[in-house]
Every structure is written in structure tokens, then in C-alpha cells.
């Protein structure tokens, strides 16, 4: 029987700057029940405080709703392990708030086919940021990814849409019913999941572009 | 205990690349970013960008850009620096740094001497 | 890109004086999350940077007390209330609001 193994704080996420969540993970246990407390102070404080919630965020984490959320203050946190026989402590760990975003996934996907007279058809389309992120203070950029895939195919092919909302793809494969996605991170933050699947059917005389290129 | 171990000096020809290590430990390596700085003799830092190992995203410096790569093998917990088209101008330490969930660098490795010279 | 201006170039103490180092930066420092992101480093002789203060004021874990920071927009400064022999070193400032990031030029600090 020991003391507990060193444990280490190893993800903070944030679902809109409003609220965040971190997680660690256990040392060795030393064969005992071990009981864990993460406290913190936020920058220019000297004062520790408490997790305030170690349910939400599922077992061995620390959720700080809105009223302990602020980006304007770096957190230094640390994880205490302790059981009969001793206690041990994480590193310290920093948190800006700014940096641990990982938004939900964009919304209202939507895909069509266009086919002008005058030019090659192409698929375009569009969506909107998640509803939690505000995006007109400017501080918070949104980047986007999209893939796409014809439904019985084992590769995705991604392509980066940049601070977009809308995106045209111009080689296609003529017949195909085509799964389209889309996801978005901040520019120092984490990618979302991936939005769900929007269907889309390719018409058979869909002319394939010579060149596979996308456009903005 | 973080660690951040680079690879060992290097001499390198005008026009030819190098490829710097940088091997962590002590930590999960996805959790963090890790930045690329620069140091030529005498001079002060020049940062040359940063890549997030959790999914290799990277933001770089314009002026390295195209230039520099930053790859990370998460395997082995090895970050990589890949400078090409190389100039005497380019004779300096290279440093890896990791930040935490911040934007500033808690942890810094050794150093790697990049030498080039005709 | 944002340019770092520090003065003086170097600086000579006697052990147990006050030391002043000032950083200047071409534009604000205010990020649009209104932080500011200003840190100062040292390097000591023979070794990679340090980690001294982040975000203006605050010092690093393991940073001793005499060490301090303070400024705002454009004009920050890093104070060391009674220089110690162990010291020595280049101190640098850098900005992480703008990418890329930079640092300034570096002050080299002496014990007389």
C-alpha cells in the first residue's frame, strides 16, 4: 500500500468561452480508495478556491460554469490524489480561457447542385455558425473544414473552407449519392465534431470538370 | 517532469534542408501546442510558428512560410521543424517551446545549433 | 509585424539595487478578448529562455517576488527590486496578441 501516483490535468474545453471544463487523469491508485480535489486561483489572486462541480463533466474532472468563467483571467489549477498513506499533486496546470474553445459543429448544412448554362455544374454549399459562438465581438475568428464522400466510398476527401460559409466543388462523380460534412474550430482552439450528414444526389449527366479543383 | 529533448547540432550546405527534433515527455503530448523560435549568434528570438499536435493544425510565421514545416509524430512524441532552401542566414539555435492552454511558452528545450556554410 | 523596442541595451548593478528594464511595442498590445499579452523571459548564459512574467504582471511558478511587471497598451516595464548575482542574463519581452509573435531585441543585465 502507498501513496497515490502523481496525477496530470490533461484537457480543458470550453463549448463557447462562457463555460469550461478539465479533465485528469489518476496516478496509480497504491491500492488504496484515493480521493481527489483540483483547486485554483486566477491570476492576481493569491486566494485558492475549490472546484466548484466535479459532476457535470463526468467522473475526475471540473466543470466552472458561467458565474466562475471569466476570459479575462489566466486559472492556475492543480489536482490533489490523496489516501491513507500519503497525497501527491499534479503540476500546475494554466488556463486562458481564449484557447480552449471547441465549438459545437456548424448548422443548417445545405448542398445543391447547380448546373448554369454557360458554365461547368458544380456543388455548392452552406451553413451557419453554432449558435453558442459570438461572432460579432471579432476577437472570435471560425474556421471551417468540409468532407465529403460518395455513400459507399472508404475515404473522405476534406477540404479547408477557411473563415467561409459557403463553398463550391466542381469534380464530382455523375450518378453518385454524395455524404457531405462540415466542422469549425477557432483559430487556437479545437475542432468541433463534424456536423451530421447531408445527403445529395449527383444527376448522371453531371459533367466532370477536368481539373480537380474546389472554389471559394 | 516535462521534458523537451532536441536533436544534435548540424552542419548544413547552402540549398540543402534540415530537420530538427524535439522529443517530449512528462506530459500528454496532444494536450499542448509547441512553437518553433530562433536564435542567431548574438541576435534575440524570431519566432517561426506553432503547431498544435492534436491535429497538426499550424499557424506560421509569413516569413518562413513555405519554407518551414512543422510536423508531429504522436507515436513518439516528437515534434519536428523542417527548414529548407537553406542560407547563412540561417545559422542559429533552434529552440522547441510548449505553452500550456496559453499563448505564452512555460517550457522551452535545449537548443539545436543549425550551421550553414559552404 | 508588430516591432519590439527595448531600452537599455544593457545594464550594469550593483547586487542588492533596483534594475529597470522598458519595452515598447508599435501597436497596442489589447487582443480583442481584451487581454494583453506581454511576456518577458530571461536567458541566462549558456541556457534555452525562461519564463519570468506572462500577461504583463503576473509572475511565473518558481519566479521569486523582486521580480515585477506592470504597463499597459504600448509601454510596459519589468522591475527587479534588488538584483541578485544569479540574475545575469538577457531579458526579453514578447507579444503573443499579433501573430507572429514576436520579441524584443533583449537587455543584457550585468552585476558590477
Known amino acids: 500500500q502507498l501513496p497515490p501516483g502523481k496525477p496530470e490535468i490533461f484537457k480543458c474545453r470550453s463549448p463557447n468561452k462562457e463555460t469550461f471544463t478539465c479533465w485528469w487523469r489518476p496516478g496509480t491508485d497504491g491500492g488504496l480508495p484515493t480521493n481527489y480535489s483540483l483547486t485554483y486561483h486566477r491570476e492576481g489572486e493569491t486566494l485558492m478556491h475549490e472546484c466548484p462541480d466535479y459532476i457535470t463533466g463526468g467522473p475526475n474532472s471540473c466543470h466552472f460554469g458561467k458565474q466562475y468563467t471569466s476570459m479575462w483571467r489566466t486559472y492556475v489549477m492543480m489536482v490533489n490524489a490523496t489516501n491513507q498513506m500519503g497525497s501527491s499533486f499534479s503540476d500546475e496546470l494554466y488556463v486562458d480561457v481564449t484557447y480552449i474553445v471547441q465549438p459545437d459543429p456548424p448548422l443548417e448544412l445545405t448542398v445543391e447542385v447547380k448546373q448554369p448554362e454557360d458554365r461547368k455544374p458544380y456543388l455548392w454549399m452552406k451553413w451557419s455558425p453554432p449558435t453558442l459562438i459570438d461572432l460579432k465581438t471579432g476577437w472570435f475568428t471560425l474556421l471551417y473544414e468540409i468532407r465529403l464522400k460518395p455513400e459507399k466510398a472508404a475515404e473522405w476527401e476534406t477540404h479547408f473552407a477557411g473563415q467561409q460559409t459557403e463553398f463550391k466543388i466542381l469534380s464530382l462523380h455523375p450518378g453518385q449519392k454524395y455524404l457531405v460534412q462540415v466542422r469549425c474550430k477557432p483559430d487556437h482552439g479545437y475542432w468541433s465534431a463534424w456536423s451530421p450528414a447531408t445527403f445529395i444526389q449527383i444527376p448522371s449527366d453531371f459533367i466532370m470538370n477536368d481539373h480537380h479543383h474546389h472554389h471559394h | 517532469e516535462v521534458q523537451l529533448v532536441q536533436s544534435g547540432a548540424e552542419v548544413k550546405k547552402p540549398g540543402s534542408s534540415v530537420k530538427v527534433s524535439c522529443k517530449a515527455s512528462?506530459?500528454?503530448?496532444?494536450?499542448?501546442?509547441i512553437h518553433w523560435v530562433r536564435q542567431a549568434p548574438g541576435q534575440g528570438l524570431e519566432w517561426i510558428g506553432e503547431?498544435?499536435?492534436?491535429?497538426?493544425?499550424?499557424n506560421y510565421n509569413q516569413k518562413f512560410k513555405g519554407r518551414a514545416t512543422l510536423t508531429v509524430d504522436k507515436s513518439s512524441s516528437t515534434a519536428y521543424m523542417e527548414l529548407s532552401s537553406l542560407r547563412s542566414e540561417d545559422t542559429a539555435v533552434y529552440y522547441c517551446a510548449r505553452s500550456f492552454f496559453t499563448n505564452w511558452f512555460a517550457y522551452w528545450g535545449q537548443g539545436t545549433l543549425v550551421t550553414v556554410s559552404s | 509585424d508588430v516591432v519590439m523596442t527595448q531600452t537599455p541595451l544593457s545594464l550594469s548593478v550593483t547586487p542588492g539595487q533596483p534594475a529597470s528594464i522598458s519595452c515598447r511595442s508599435s501597436q497596442s498590445l489589447v487582443h480583442s478578448n481584451g487581454n494583453t499579452y506581454l511576456h518577458w523571459y530571461l536567458q541566462k548564459p549558456g541556457q534555452s529562455p525562461q519564463l519570468l512574467i506572462y500577461?504583463?504582471?503576473n509572475r511565473f511558478s518558481g519566479v521569486p517576488d523582486r521580480f515585477s511587471g506592470s504597463g499597459s497598451g504600448t509601454d510596459f516595464t519589468l522591475k527587479i527590486s534588488r538584483v541578485e548575482a544569479e540574475d545575469v542574463g538577457v531579458y526579453f519581452c514578447?507579444?503573443?496578441?499579433?501573430?507572429?509573435?514576436?520579441f524584443g531585441g533583449g537587455t543584457k543585465v550585468e552585476i558590477k
Open positions: 503547431i498544435d499536435p492534436s491535429d497538426s493544425y499550424t
Open positions: 512528462g506530459y500528454t503530448f496532444t494536450s499542448y501546442w
Open positions: 514578447s507579444q503573443s496578441t499579433h501573430v507572429p509573435f514576436t
Open positions: 500577461k504583463v504582471s
